[in-house]
Amino acid sequence: HLYPGEVCPGMDIRNNLTRLHELENCSVIEGHLQILLMFKTRPEDFRDLSFPKLIMITDYLLLFRVYGLESLKDLFPNLTVIRGSRLFFNYALVIFEMVHLKELGLYNLMNITRGSVRIEKNNELCYLATIDWSRILDSVEDNYIVLNKDDNEECGDICPGTAKGKTNCPATVINGQFVERCWTHSHCQKVCPTICKSHGCTAEGLCCHSECLGNCSQPDDPTKCVACRNFYLDGRCVETCPPPYYHFQDWRCVNFSFCQDLHHKCKNSRRQGCHQYVIHNNKCIPECPSGYTMNSSNLLCTPCLGPCPKVCHLLEGEKTIDSVTSAQELRGCTVINGSLIINIRGGNNLAAELEANLGLIEEISGYLKIRRSYALVSLSFFRKLRLIRGETLEIGNYSFYALDNQNLRQLWDWSKHNLTITQGKLFFHYNPKLCLSEIHKMEEVSGTKGRQERNDIALKTNGDQASCENELLKFSYIRTSFDKILLRWEPYWPPDFRDLLGFMLFYKEAPYQNVTEFDGQDACGSNSWTVVDIDPPLRSNDPKSQNHPGWLMRGLKPWTQYAIFVKTLVTFSDERRTYGAKSDIIYVQTDATNPSVPLDPISVSNSSSQIILKWKPPSDPNGNITHYLVFWERQAEDSELFELDYCLKGLKLPSRTWSPPFESEDSQKHNQSEYEDSAGECCSCPKTDSQILKELEESSFRKTFEDYLHNVVFVPRKTSSGTGAEDPRPS
């Protein structure tokens, strides 16, 4: 009974039906199933296609632009569970732009374990209002079901028996509407007694075993489940995998040799992106979690002492990093066995990219050479570099070599960075923006002071075009409001006051107080700081009443911490000696203000004396939210409730239906009760600001989803004819 067929990998079936036959023997798809972009298929192509063995999909099911497909009832008649281990943009079931789909027809679908449902832009799709999604998944409020034929009330959804005046299908209440539940005109929705929870029940309504999920052939027997709530092991459902088994992919138990085979298959394969599976916490998982390293004898993840080491041996003993691509080859390395030559002339978002790829390097066994790297402003992307051994040296016995770096202004932030150079000398020439004080500081910190000879550090070609600030600017006044920060600082005048061109104020959002001046900067225009140029103040002849320069920062975010510093802008003096001043980086938080409104309020009455309210926090809390205020007001009962004959056939119960989150314009149009429709004289009220805002948010949300969908599903054709689909970055 339990998963009678094979376990198949995730599939991406597109363009034509050829590969659909690979589903033939699959009981479980371990991954996602995407069927999409079939423009030439017709209804008759699907007539004899059926995959009755398919019981479960572990990730998500996505159907997108498959022409001619009118129902899924024959295609997947026994699909019972979609686990949603990995989701497609928060969704486990996505039916999007299926132009000919008339009904879902997944009449055995009993459980979507994680994630929600997105059914959108399906012009012919009916039988949506007849499905009670709350019986299938928990987070119904996150479902997004809009712009289908069902919205336009053009569907004549008839459940089994209705044509003959019978009600064969169970009815449930949603938003006060008591509706028969069915998937198609011939298939009811199976609704189990509430006590069965999600375990499922037999046709007679007897609950399945607590380890079952969705359905079973006999009650209270873990070997007779259709799918398992937790884990599957040798024909039965179990709560957890007993030794010597390991949990795999969140749904089944596997033995050590299974995990080992996966590990070796990948190790011996040349295919990029495969995983060398390991064992951790009784699970067979793709890789060790952060802070663990694999013990190669038993595949177990063991805690690293300190950061996990990854030794990278360089071919020919050295490697030149001349682009982000070449830096990516060292991603994750902690120890470099060899020497590094950095020669970066340009690129996008360099500082961040270099840190992402080289930021874990702690040790270089040879030398480090920074040569003609015009794009570099700082070496702080080597965030963890602590040791240069100098076991091999650059010609001239140099273990650190910096030549002709036109924009290099900082080596590291020496107040936070320790670097030891075991042997070898320093070489600095033609680094015009690198102040000598920065180089001398490196000599002290790295323990190389006294090793250098006279010409190793050029006095004339380092820092000759820099404003080597030797004075500290101090802030004299700081004031905040919810969207402004006012700063003033002590006056600064160079020996010749005409040399002061003004000040540069740098600021950026900084959630943590760990920012350095050169974070995120490179010479190609990337700069995470906002920079303001400020004119010098009027110079007073009275030294006692010098004007304090300042700036009012406007348009800031409430309740947000900013990192701020200011430095002088001075001209180069004739003697090639430049002056200047700079403040420390300070952190200032704007004040709190009123939060934006709570989002997506939902009200449901669960009894005659109770209303349950749910809402999401505001998008802009603008401070620490301590409590919410709920206001309510009793309203006069609708007189129609007393006047109606409730025995009238076909009468829909009048109800105040609540609007689910992200309700579309179309569904709002058709949410009016039939009494309003029949009047025909009422004009629609103008939209409120909140409605307009909601529609804008809705439109933006829809665009985001569509962009995501298009980015994921449209991939360039492969030249080789591979069978496995590329993994499309699910969430």
């Epitope: 402004k484 320069p549 700036w551 009012l552 406007r554």
Partner: antibody, heavy 118, light 108 residues
Framework: EVQLLESGGGLVQPGGSLRLSCAAS????????MNWVRQAPGKGLEWVSS????????DVANSVVGRFTISRDNSKNTLYLQMNSLRAEDTAVYYC???????????WGQGTLVTVSS | QSVLTQPPSASGTPGQRVTISCSGS????????VNWYQQLPGTAPKLLIY???KRPSGVPDRFSGSKSGTSASLAISGLRSEDEADYYC?????????FGGGTKLTVL
């Protein structure tokens, strides 16, 4: 009716000190930022100092920094300006004015004259 | 020397329209709302216009304000003898209140 009444002005020698007061009534004093503005004889208006409603922020003009201190006592609905190391150029009529930060001064007192002369 | 420049004097006959200018820079008028004050002889200043063009209650609609770029102006139409006074513009510059030098309006 909003009323602001300054007091404490007078004749003082250079280098001397003086403390001005401003008694407020007709509004919730503790909710408003308060300011001192001065006007030298025959000259224009010059902002001197401001203090926020809770006294969290106190600001003074560059010309008086280090010599003048603004303070307030919300329980007494009174604003103060402590003036030390007075100079001849501090001679002026000193007005107390109500006005929020980065906003306008909506109510003014009648002013008190401070004369610094030997 | 004020950072906001006003003409020292202006004049007009009763019933005439008079305009007083106030010129500054991008860091003050360009970055702040302009307020105008009237100071009748021997009295304290009084708020006349705030936020560039708004009038407090009690101020006649003969007084109007405007701002463009780094300059602002105060217009008085239907001039009356009781309008004879000093007029000051005021803005905020880096958190400091700054006044113009003042314009003495004479009603001929």
């Amino acid at each position: 009716e909003v009323q602001l009444l300054e007091s404490g002005g007078g004749l003082v020698q250079p280098g001397g000190s003086l403390r001005l007061s401003c008694a407020a009534s007709g509004f919730t004093f503790s909710s408003y930022e308060m300011n001192w503005v001065r006007q030298a004889p025959g000259k224009g208006l010059e902002w001197v100092s401001s203090i926020s409603s809770s006294s969290r922020y106190a600001d003074v003009a560059n010309s008086v920094v280090g010599r003048f201190t603004i303070s307030r006592d919300n329980s007494k609905n009174t604003l103060y300006l402590q003036m030390n190391s007075l100079r001849a150029e501090d001679t002026a009529v000193y007005y107390c004015a109500r006005g929020e930060w980065l906003d306008h001064f909506d109510y003014w007192g009648q002013g008190t004259l401070v004369t610094v002369s030997s | 020397q004020s950072v906001l420049t006003q003409p020292p004097s202006a004049s007009g006959t009763p019933g005439q329209r008079v305009t007083i200018s106030c010129s500054g820079s991008s860091s003050n008028i360009g970055n702040s709302a302009v307020n105008w004050y009237q100071q009748l002889p021997g009295t304290a200043p009084k708020l006349l216009i705030y936020d560039n063009n708004k009038r407090p209650s009690g101020v006649p609609d003969r007084f109007s304000g405007s701002k463009s770029g780094t300059s602002a102006s105060l217009a008085i139409s239907g001039l009356r003898s009781e309008d004879e006074a000093d007029y000051y513009c005021q803005v905020w510059d880096s958190g400091t209140a700054v006044f113009g030098g003042g314009t003495k309006l004479t009603v001929l």
